[in-house]
Interface confidence: medium
């Protein structure tokens, strides 16, 4: 059992059939000796008396808000969660696995610079009685700070029968150095907690891996005289790290048919112009990604061609 | 070129070869197979490499202030991973492919090194640790970290060199 | 001459953690791959864990890979294995091993008992 | 991973005579391959390595050969504390063992 706020406990489960559980004591916070009694959750069944309450923990029904009493009035209370492992492994039911970019992925994060702001999300079926709390730090044995705001609910969709939510949170490194080398991973930690189950889920990544540029900013077209020919300028997003010509990005514009099976034509380049053939109906688009690491694209930028 | 003395180094062709160097180590990448370093449990133990870190003048500011800390990091981790990628660990079996990017990755690392510090002049080098013999069975997962961090290391160098090319250039 | 000295084995509840050791003389410990090689009673050897000399670069078996972390303290001289979220199938003897530059086990500890039952 | 088999099971042989214990690999290891002996309630004991040299303190009646995918541990003339398990492993990949031979007296 350990503390993961005050007067909130989790105990750690082997959950399996006719599993043993866990003896946990609990101690009323009062300098009262007599007259204790103990109650669990909205019911009056008196579960014991006197200063502690010895219990053996087995399942979700074990599990809730201990409260002691002395004549009527409320002392203290201890809520006991839940963490199950089955098989010595921890249970991941309330988030969805993402399945990107690998199996048992859940939590996704992204960085638009290396300024060291990123944003984590993740994606669970649950509605109600569920809180997350996050913290992140470099390294993990000898921390260095990033601060985490509160987790907050930043999409919902349909998926076939189900509704599907996503939350999301954003971070920020405290002593981000943008031009350095990363040699430390962030680590992120996710607490869950869905009515009496508590679960934990952690990502680790470097910045550098997860950046994803914004699209190109005003992306236009200028037809050239006698000519089917038209350049494509574009800027670099504001959101991108400054100077440029430090933090240069790489750009891939295509133009695309009306029909998904017209052949795109691709061109690379690091400039932020390009000279390409505008066909009829047709669209161009561009999008940017780091130019000496590989990291993710950008999304698309597009302007229609005629 | 950079001397000891603290003359400019050729920007534009250390620009060159640096987005060079990037473009080789990605395309070398595959070849040591699609293992992920989370999975191996070791993140915090990246230091048998050279990083490029805060203080060490890399960032738009301190190459404005003097260049030559930079300049004489980079040259350390050039010279360090030249001689990772010529030891047993890429050299050793199991081979390479006949035509795998690190036999020119190994050249450019050894070409850039020089662009900065040509024959005659001395940087005082750090130490670089004599590499254990590795093991055939390490090998691939040696590979697979080296180049990873390679990776980044001269995605740093690449910045450094493109923004001098464009700002400190004569 | 070369001595392994392993400790911190024990009985541990499925879901539980150890902390094993290895104290080692006689050689030079800080130029030397070290590895763990175990054993389940009555059964043939397993390699589980390597580490390079200077602990920058680690090695695992899939059966124990993101449960398992080998680390070392070449000021200690001291090799150390973290076993977590333990199962019943990594009960096992655990010998620490000082791997040869041909990949090979030269120089074996006595072991330590891990026995993970509830 | 490259699966090690070990043949025979269990070998066994009169003290005096000659021992062959035969190991393959399910690919090429080349000559990255190790023979040890384990004695009941001791650890093992490396005897040969890089599939032929003999490690330091080990007595000449024990040799190794092959490359590839076939090698031979023989044991020229079996003395009482020879009776053994004996293992083969390879350091070509991710380090694997054979499940072992027994030798005991016959």
């Known amino acids: 059992i350990w503390e993961l706020k005050k007067d909130v406990y989790v105990v750690e489960l082997d959950w399996y059939p006719d599993a043993p559980g866990e003896m946990v004591v609990l101690t009323c916070d009062t300098p009262e000796e007599d007259g204790i009694t103990w109650t669990l959750d909205q019911s009056s069944e008196v579960l014991g008396s006197g200063k502690t309450l010895t219990i053996q923990v087995k399942e979700f029904g074990d599990a809730g808000q201990y409260t002691c009493h002395k004549g009527g009035e409320v002392l203290s209370h201890s809520l006991l969660l839940l963490h199950k492992k089955e098989d010595g492994i921890w249970s991941t039911d309330i988030l969805k696995d993402q399945k990107e970019p690998k199996n048992k992925t859940f939590l996704r994060c992204e960085a638009k610079n290396y300024s060291g702001r990123f944003t984590c999300w993740w994606l669970t079926t649950i509605s109600t009685d569920l809180t997350f709390s996050v913290k992140s730090s470099r390294g993990s044995s000898d921390p260095q700070g990033v601060t985490c705001g509160a987790a907050t609910l930043s999409a919902e969709r349909v998926r076939g029968d189900n509704k599907e939510y996503e939350y999301s949170v954003e971070c920020q490194e405290d002593s981000a150095c943008p031009a350095a080398e990363e040699s430390l991973p962030i680590e992120v930690m996710v607490d869950a907690v869905h009515k009496l189950k508590y679960e934990n889920y952690t990502s680790s990544f470097f910045i550098r891996d997860i950046i994803k540029p914004d699209p190109p900013k005003n992306l236009q077209l200028k037809p050239l005289k006698n000519s089917r020919q038209v350049e494509v300028s574009w800027e670099y997003p504001d959101t991108w790290s400054t100077p440029h010509s430090y933090f240069s990005l790489t750009f891939c514009v295509q133009v695309q048919g009306k029909s998904k099976r017209e052949k795109k034509d691709r061109v690379f380049t690091d400039k932020t112009s390009a000279t390409v053939i505008c066909r009829k109906n047709a669209s161009i688009s561009v999008r940017a990604q780091d130019r000496y690491y590989s990291s993710s694209w950008s999304e698309w930028a597009s302007v229609p061609c005629s | 070129r950079a001397v000891p003395g603290g003359s400019s180094p050729a920007w534009t062709q250390c620009q060159q070869l640096s987005q060079k160097l990037c473009t080789l180590a990605w395309s070398a990448h595959p070849l040591v197979g699609h293992m992920d370093l989370r999975e191996e449990g070791d993140e915090e133990t990246t230091n048998d490499v050279p990083h490029i870190q805060c203080g060490d003048g890399c960032d738009p500011q301190g190459l404005r202030d003097n260049s030559q800390f930079c300049l004489q990091r980079i040259h350390q981790g050039l010279i360090f991973y030249e001689k990772l990628l010529g030891s047993d660990i890429f050299t050793g079996e199991p081979s390479l492919l006949p035509d795998s990017p690190v036999g020119q990755l190994h050249a450019s690392l050894l070409g850039l090194s020089q662009l900065l510090q040509p024959e005659g002049h001395h940087w005082e080098t750090q130490q670089i640790p004599s590499l254990s013999p590795s093991q055939p069975w390490q090998r691939l997962l040696l590979r697979f970290k080296i180049l990873r961090s390679l990776q980044a290391f001269v995605a740093v160098a690449a910045r450094v060199f493109a923004h001098g090319a464009a700002t400190l250039s004569p | 001459e070369v001595q392994l000295l392993e400790s911190g084995g024990g009985l541990v509840q499925p879901g539980g953690s150890l902390r094993l050791s290895c104290a080692a003389s006689?050689?030079?410990?800080?130029?030397?791959?070290m590895g763990w090689v175990r054993q389940a009673p009555g059964k043939g050897l397993e390699w589980v864990s390597g580490i390079w000399p200077s602990g920058g670069w680690t090695f695992y078996a899939d059966s124990v890979k993101g449960r398992f972390t080998i680390s070392r303290d070449n000021s200690k001289n001291t090799l150390y294995l973290q076993m977590n979220s333990l199962r019943a199938e990594d009960m096992a003897v655990y010998y620490c091993?000082?791997?040869?530059?041909?990949?090979?086990?030269?120089?074996w500890g006595q072991g330590t008992l891990v026995t993970v039952s509830s | 991973d490259i699966q090690m088999t070990q043949s025979p099971g269990t070998l066994s042989v009169s003290p005096g005579e000659r021992a062959t214990l035969s190991c393959r690999a399910s690919?090429?290891?080349?000559?990255?391959l190790a023979w040890y002996q384990q004695r009941p309630g001791q650890a093992p004991r490396l005897l040969i390595y890089?599939?032929?040299t003999r490690a330091t303190g080990i007595p000449a009646r024990f040799s190794g050969s092959g490359s590839g995918t076939e090698f031979t541990l023989t044991i020229s003339s079996l003395q009482s504390e020879d009776f053994a398990i004996y293992y083969c492993?390879?350091?070509?990949?991710?380090?694997?063992f054979g499940p072992g031979t027994k030798v005991d007296i016959k």
């Open positions: 690919q090429s290891v080349s000559n990255n």
């Open positions: 006689g050689f030079t410990f800080s130029k030397y791959n």
């Open positions: 890089s599939a032929s």
């Open positions: 492993q390879q350091s070509y990949s991710t380090l694997t």
């Open positions: 091993a000082r791997v040869s530059e041909y990949g090979s086990f030269d120089y």
